[in-house]
Amino acid sequence: KESCDVQLYIKRQSEHSILAGDPFELECPVKYCANRPHVTWCKLNGTTCVKLEDRQTSWKEEKNISFFILHFEPVLPNDNGSYRCSANFQSNLIESHSTTLYVTDVKSASERPSKDEMASRPWLLYR
């Protein structure tokens, strides 16, 4: 029952919480049989997905699966958002579910007053 359809193994509602300033690799697991498909990453902007053509990508080949990787070196605060990989295979376009990156900006997080601080010193809210 093994099919030779290209499969992209990104699950619905998948997400990653990452820190700004760190390196990060976003993986698109790809199964193919003979010829490796052409795979791209895009970032969702509303209902359209904007192709990331100028970003560093690479392939990692393992025994039964390959990974098309989008590199973030380093992660920037505006990398926050949803991404999708797509494979072109025999003139068919196969799209993955979107995967969401939640980027924490370490700099602003360290400057932000804690919940306890805000409770005991409410004027901090109005600094």
Partner: antibody
């Protein structure tokens, strides 16, 4: 050949915890795309999806029962476990595990024979 | 949750005749990835469910080609071109596009 078999206690009293085991063969839960779901069916009624565990240990639950459910796997022994806390008579049903295969998303291509639970005081 | 409604509740068919079951969803099952995750199962009397069709129209392995699935959006149909005795049981549609995954109430196929 893919097979799945459920096992459970058969009878529980209200407020007890239900522990179910799905033992399977013919596939590995470490393979990309593979998963196992639990689905239940009260006698003479329809099907209700409960929970799913994916190849990478990611989990999804039916929100209507999420607070009472836990799902886990033992990949090396080809088993998936479901726990439901504080059972009630409404949990009386046949419980099935099903293999989640993948074609862009999960679909259930093989089902176990089911294990019956009766909750009664 | 997405509600799946099947009709008719019961279908009485003579062997060799065609049969058709309708399944409607309260939300579109067309996913943002372009696929429609609508599936069909058959539960024969006293047995566990068996997969028939996934992704609207793809026949699962070992399923005879007298079964065909069609539809889009919110309206779907399962057709049997010539009913055989082994086809009796309850047919369920279910959707895998939206969490939680949900099932139709079932259509019982009886042999006349």
């Amino acid at each position: 050949q893919v097979t799945l078999k459920e096992s459970g206690p058969g009878i529980l009293q209200p407020s007890q915890t239900l522990s179910l085991t799905c033992s399977f063969s013919g596939f590995s839960l470490s393979t990309f795309g593979m998963g196992v779901s639990w689905i239940r069916q009260p006698s003479g009624k329809g099907l209700e999806w409960l929970a799913h565990i994916y190849w990478d240990d990611d989990k999804r639950f039916n929100p209507s029962l999420k607070s009472r459910l836990s799902i886990s796997k033992d990949t090396s022994n080809n088993q998936v476990f479901l726990k439901i806390t504080t059972v009630d008579t409404a949990d009386t049903a046949t419980y099935y595990c099903a293999r989640g295969n993948w074609d862009g998303e999960t679909y259930f291509d093989y089902w176990g024979q089911g294990t019956t639970l009766t909750v009664s005081s | 949750d997405v509600v799946m409604t099947q009709s008719p509740l019961t279908l009485s068919v003579t062997i060799g005749q065609p049969a058709s079951i309708s399944c409607k969803s309260t939300q579109s099952l067309l996913d943002s990835d372009g696929k429609t995750y609508l599936n069909w199962l058959l539960q024969r009397p006293g047995q566990s469910p068996k997969s028939l069709i996934y992704l609207v129209s793809k026949l699962d392995s070992g399923v005879p080609d007298r079964f065909t699935g069609s539809g889009s959006g919110t309206d779907f149909t399962l057709k049997i071109s010539r009913v055989e005795a082994e086809d009796l049981g309850v047919y369920y549609c279910w959707q895998g596009t939206h969490f939680p995954w949900t099932f139709g109430g079932g259509t019982k196929l009886e042999i006349k």
